[in-house]
Structure formats: C-alpha cells, structure tokens
C-alpha cells in the first residue's frame, strides 16, 4: 500500500513538475526590466526564450519573436536545448510511468517489469528535473552577469547633455517557475526510484518442487531467480507458484539526445 502511494505520489509530483517545466519554457517572463533605481518609464520590457515583449502603460503589449538562430547567444541556445531535453525526457518518463503504476493492470505484467519501468521513469524524471534546473540556472547566471555589466555601463557615453538610459533586466517569473518545477520533477523521480525498490520482490532461495503422480521421485528445479532491476535479464523459467511465464526481454532503450540548435 505504501509502495503504491509512493509511486502514485511520485507520478503526480512529476506530472506537476513537467507541466511547470513546459509552462516555464513557454513563458515570456524569463527576464524582466529592472525598475529599481531606474527612471520611471511608460514602457515595461520583458523577455523569454522565444520572443521579447513590451507592455505599455495603456496595457498595449507587443511581442517579437527571435527569428534568427545564428544571431542568438550560444547561452540562450543552450538553455533552450536543456529545457527541451528536460520536457522530452519528462514526457517519455510520464508515458513509461503510466504503465508502471501498480494501480493500473495491463495484461499479465509482473511486478518485476513494473519495477523496471518505475525505475526507468524515475531516472528520466531526475534527469528531466536536473535539465530544467540547469537551464534556468544558466539563464539566471547570464542575467546576473549582464545586470552588473549594464550597471557599470549605465551612464557611459554622456558626452554632452544627452543621456542614454540602458535597460537592465532582472529575474522573471519563469525562472522561479522553472526552479520549482525542476525541483518537483526531481523529487518525483526520487520517489519513483524509492517505489521501485518496494515493487521488486525480495530474492527467494526456496526450491520449487515438482510432483509426479507416476513415481515417488522428486525433481528439483534450479533455485530462486532474482527480480533484478538490471536491464536485459531474460528469464524463461516457469514459476510454479504463480503460473506466470517470463519470456519477454526487459530491454529499455533510452531516447537519443537531439541537438536543438
């Protein structure tokens, strides 16, 4: 019961986390105009991974997409890639974890198979969460660097009377959404991994006995098999006590990492 609860909770937490990662990736407020110690303007600027926006005091909002790939900073491209990899891994993890849920019965799937799938999805959630946290942190670091650079240059080039006020950017809401979502996905992944241990049956060393009506001879079958979480175990022995046969390969192929540039 506790295992089912842990697995279910891990799934729900990961689901919320991945939804948050998707939301953060799509949000426009990755960086917002710093209003502190700046002249008050009737225009507010904010930027996302895919476009930059301007909101005027009237409420009029105008967004422009980044219609270039080569012209964008490498760091921004890296952040995009990390977030997309995080979403893809998370989505696959969710798909795998749905079939791994103990409360869902699919054919004659054994607990060992569900344990393997739970572990796989858990690892995927952990990597997904780490990708999101890394992406958001890289962007935040980029912002901090640019903030202090623009602060230093804020009043440069004031040759005469004319001043150019440089727009400084600070952390936007998307960063906090991303950090929290990444953390939730990570926690969900850990919970799935913990649940996996509970799902896997303990190693048994009893001997399965086969009785024959014709004689008194007793045939001993090879001892217990491990409900291992190692990939690729192909156990074809029949277990008398549950009558279930394992003939399918438990091979988990990880998705290849694409370059989103």
């Amino acid at each position: 019961m506790a295992v089912t609860a842990c697995q279910g909770l891990g799934f729900v937490v990961s689901l919320i986390g991945i939804a948050g990662i998707i939301a953060a990736t799509c949000m426009d407020q990755w960086s917002t105009q710093d209003l502190y110690n700046n002249p008050v303007t009737a225009v507010f600027n904010y930027q996302g991974l895919w476009r930059s926006c301007v909101r005027e005091s009237s409420g009029f909002t105008e967004c422009r997409g980044y219609f270039t790939l080569l012209g964008l900073p490498a760091m921004l491209q890296a952040v995009r890639a990390l977030m997309i990899v995080g979403i893809v891994l998370g989505a696959i993890g969710l798909l795998v974890s749905i079939f791994a849920l103990k409360c869902i019965r699919i054919g004659s799937m054994e607990d060992s198979a569900k344990a393997n799938m739970t572990l796989t999805s858990g690892i995927m959630f952990i990597v997904s969460g780490l990708c999101a946290i890394a992406g958001v942190s890289v962007f935040a670091n980029m912002l901090v660097t640019n903030f202090w650079m623009s602060t230093a240059n804020m009043y440069t080039g004031m040759g005469g009377m004319v001043q150019t006020v440089q727009t400084r950017y600070t952390f936007g809401a998307a960063l906090f959404v991303g950090w929290v979502a990444g953390g939730l996905t990570l926690i969900g992944g850990v919970m799935m991994c913990i649940a996996c241990r509970g799902l896997a049956p303990e190693e048994t060393n009893y001997k399965a006995v086969s009785y024959h009506a014709s004689g008194h001879s007793v045939a001993y079958k090879p001892g217990g098999f491990k409900a291992s979480t190692g990939f690729g175990s192909n156990t074809k022995n029949k277990k008398i006590y549950d009558g279930g046969a394992r003939t399918e390969d438990e091979v988990q192929s990880y998705p290849s990492k694409h370059d989103y540039v």
Epitope: N45, S57, S58, V165, T167
Partner: antibody, heavy 118, light 113 residues
Framework: QVQLQESGPGLVKPSETLSLTCTVS????????VSWIRQPPGKGLEWIGV???????YYNSALKSRVTISVDTSKNQFSLKLSSVTAADTAVYYC????????????WGQGTLVTVSS | DIVMTQSPDSLAVSLGERATINCKSS????????????LTWYQQKPGQPPKLLIY???TRESGVPDRFSGSGSGTDFTLTISSLQAEDVAVYYC?????????FGGGTKVEIK
Amino acid sequence: QVQLQESGPGLVKPSETLSLTCTVSGFSLTDYGVSWIRQPPGKGLEWIGVMWGGGNTYYNSALKSRVTISVDTSKNQFSLKLSSVTAADTAVYYCARQRYGGNAMDYWGQGTLVTVSS
Amino acid sequence: DIVMTQSPDSLAVSLGERATINCKSSQSLLNSGNQRNYLTWYQQKPGQPPKLLIYWASTRESGVPDRFSGSGSGTDFTLTISSLQAEDVAVYYCQNSYFYPFTFGGGTKVEIK
C-alpha cells in the same frame, strides 16, 4: 463616438482647491487612461498627470504635491483636484484619452478656462 | 524630468513648400525592447484643442494626411510637412511619451510666408 467634456468653476480664489471633472463617453474607463493637460493663455502645453485604466497614476513632478487625479466609474468621470492655487495656475485645462499603443493622446476635450483670481 | 527642445520657435513657409520642425530630447526616447521611439507630435490650431498627428516618432494617426511625416531616433526627431497647405497653419508640439512625467516641447508656430 468618443467624447470628453471638461467641467468645473471658471473662477477660483487663490489658496483654494481647483476641482474639475472630465465626463467621458464612447469608451470604457477601465480600458483606457486619461491625461490632464493645461495651457496658460498664450503659452505652451503642460502635462499635469495621467490615470491609467488599471488605476495607476503619474503626476508632473512640479505639481505632484498639489495634484490628485481620481475616477468615478459609475458616473464615467475622471476628476482633477489642484490644491493651493495661485495666479500661475490660470490656464485652459484639457482632459485627453490615452491611445492604446504609443502612449499618445488621441481624443481631447474642448478644454475649460480656469482663472485664479481674488 | 526630460527636457524637450523644439526649433525653430516659429517658421514661415510658402504654400506648397516643405516645412521642417526639429525636436530634441535630453534623454533617448528609444526603447530597446521593441526598437520604438516614444515621441509624439501634436497640431494645435487657434482656439482648438491639440490634435494627435504622429506617435512612435513616425506612425501617422488615422485620418492624418500623408504630407505629414515623422522621422528620427534616440534624441533627435523631425516633423516634416512635405507640401504646406493653408489649413496647416498651427502650433506644433512634440511630446516625450516614454519617461514620466510626459513632457512637451515649447511648440513651433507655422505660418504662411
């Protein structure tokens, strides 16, 4: 169509408070901002302040301590209060709607002349 | 506060000729986020309230004749009347629409020579 009409006393005594209202029609007060502008006789335009649809207000720094702009949505009216007036506050007072985009004023009232004199 | 300086104070131009009014701001009115200049031009005829001509430095308000055009970026802006008509006699004001408080230039009076 969009209309703005200023109203208020044409004569105000020095040190008193000048109160003007701007009655609007043809647009929603919650969607658009309204600015107040004044023009002393024979002189240029001076921006007094703005109240945006969301309720944010900004004022001319020279008048900030004396001016208040408010809204009464039930009456479709904006109001301007300017305290401790002097002869220098004698002007034609205009209210104008803020355009949606560009922070420009696209519709203006006809203006009302306010004279500060004892 | 932003100081808006208009030049000349007055301008006499023959009918059909080009009229050019300059406006200079003490700070750049260019917003880096959308690359728009928040400068507005108004026309005020005698005994009338001002009328919006141009916003975002170069975008004509609907109904404004195309002989009126705005140009410039940053701190230096120009309003051009390509072919002056009798009805264009008025005072023209530029306005900072970027920084609070919004401020107007002193105005340029356009007359017929």
